[in-house]
């Protein structure tokens, strides 16, 4: 999103892209700015729609939290170093469900003013692993991915058979983890051809990932990604 | 109550392999940072180790490819596994929430490198 | 590497006095990341301040924290016989995850 001051100083231009967290990890929340030569006229605010404090104040080259919002005490940063190029994200420590939501962040410079709000998403996403399955009777593939959330969709692939519909052939089950917010997917292929590419392709409204695995008389080969969705800049 | 209990020091040879658990009640470990932070004797804290609630871990430099930390979510337990243990290993090793900051710790439990 | 020096090593005072605690960062450190413990012979540590100046649950309100960017400080206001212990400050997020400094040791004079 890309927002405009207004008031009697000129408008400057911030940019922020909307991201997603991974929940138990460090999330990052980015906003950039038109950039100032000196530092200390530099001011970030980083607010979120729904809490009443500050999410993160930084002025005069230093944080200031002194009207920061009891949910965000020890928990953000903004990268101070790189402040004085336009850098306005925010660092949000162990992010967790709740911290999804809009999020403004307003930039005043000697140049002027700016705001630009951010969508942020929180979920867990996770790599699949696939391996064969040796509990399985026939030739079998399972794949395992410790930590989504919202629940995902899971499809399988093949190579070789590119418009086939495994559903039939598949069966998917979700683990709720012990502190019953993510799961854990577990997708088991059944009746696998040697010499052909599998891929197993889990995906939510935050991330898609796909884990590749080929089975041949000598060897086992895997390969896996993670792609986050809907980053794009407002 | 939110509490935190280490075991599995214990006096051990150069060279040789220990594990510590650190059990936690009151909270659910997988949500939390947890930490390992040890203490030679007379001497100041040292962060060890952190896994994260989603399972990523860091190490510091001076234990880097010697340990590793993990979690049983089912036992609500936290471990370090320690291998190639020296002499500089001998301290005190706490394990410690991180939330906000760390603001729960065990007792500690004492892991002696000697011959 | 972020390096955090306390000072002095050791501060000798009497109970009532005002004790004030130094940590001085190699590089900045946010304000959010910047913890304070105290540690008394025999036990674990125990967290007093977050977020540079945020008192812990049940820390008395004779200890308060201040400071941001390399200077930081942990101030007791009046100190009470049961004050006197090492104490330490503590950054996060950077490489390493964690660093602690060397400890203030609070003696009685």
């Known amino acids: 999103i890309i927002g405009f001051g207004i008031s009697g100083r000129h408008s400057i231009t911030v940019t922020t892209l909307t991201s997603a967290g991974n929940i138990g990890e460090d999330g990052i929340l980015s906003c950039t700015f038109e950039p100032d030569i000196k530092l200390s006229d530099i001011v970030i605010q980083w607010l979120k729609e729904g809490v009443t404090g500050l999410v993160h104040e930084f002025k005069k080259g230093k944080d200031d939290l002194s009207d920061q919002d009891e949910m965000f005490r020890g928990r953000t940063a903004v990268f101070a170093d790189q402040v004085i190029v336009g850098n306005a994200s925010l660092r949000l420590k162990n992010v967790q469900l709740t911290d999804a939501g809009t999020y403004k962040c307003y930039i005043i410079t000697s140049k002027g003013k700016g705001n630009a709000k951010l969508e942020y998403k929180t979920g867990a996403f996770s790599i699949p692993e696939v391996n064969v399955d040796s509990n399985a009777s026939s030739e079998s593939l399972r794949c395992e991915a410790p930590r989504w959330f919202p629940q995902p969709t899971v499809v399988w692939a093949s190579q070789v058979d590119q418009g086939a519909n495994f559903s039939e052939v598949s069966n998917t089950s979700f683990e709720l983890n012990p502190e019953n917010v993510t799961m854990k997917v577990v997708s088991v292929l059944y009746n696998v051809t040697i010499n052909t590419t599998y891929s197993c392709m889990i995906e939510n409204d935050i991330a898609k990932a796909t884990g590749d695995i080929r089975v041949t008389d000598s060897e086992i080969k895997r390969q896996s990604h993670l792609q986050l969705l809907n980053s794009k800049a407002s | 109550e939110v509490q935190l209990v280490e075991s599995g020091g214990g006096l051990i040879q150069p060279g040789g392999s220990l594990r510590l658990s650190c059990a936690a009640s009151?909270?659910?470990?997988?949500?939390?940072?947890m930490n390992w932070v040890r203490q030679a004797p007379g001497k100041g804290l040292e962060w060890v180790s952190v896994?994260?609630?989603?399972?990523?871990?860091y190490y510091a430099d001076s234990v880097k490819g010697r340990v590793t930390i993990s979690r049983d979510n089912s036992k609500n337990t936290l471990y370090l596994q320690m291998n190639s243990l020296r002499a500089e290993d001998t301290a005190v090793y706490y394990c410690?929430?991180?939330?906000?900051?760390?603001?729960?710790w065990g007792q500690g439990t004492t892991v002696t490198v000697s011959s | 590497e972020i390096v955090l020096t306390q000072s002095p090593g050791t501060l000798s005072l009497s109970p009532g006095e005002r004790a004030t605690l130094s940590c001085r960062a190699s590089?900045?450190?946010?304000?959010?990341?910047l913890a304070w413990y105290q540690q008394k012979p025999g036990q674990a540590p125990r967290l007093l301040i977050y977020g540079a100046s945020s008192r812990a649950t049940g820390i008395p309100d004779r200890f308060s924290g201040s400071g941001s960017g390399t200077d930081f400080t942990l101030t007791i206001s009046r100190l009470e016989p049961e004050d006197f212990a090492v104490y330490y400050c503590q950054q996060y997020g950077s490489s390493p995850m964690y660093t602690f400094g060397q400890g203030t040791k609070l003696e009685i004079k």
């Open positions: 410690a929430r991180d939330t906000y900051a760390m603001d729960v």
């Open positions: 590089q900045s450190v946010s304000s959010s990341y």
């Open positions: 896994i994260y609630g989603s399972g990523r871990t």
């Open positions: 009151g909270f659910t470990v997988s949500s939390n940072y």
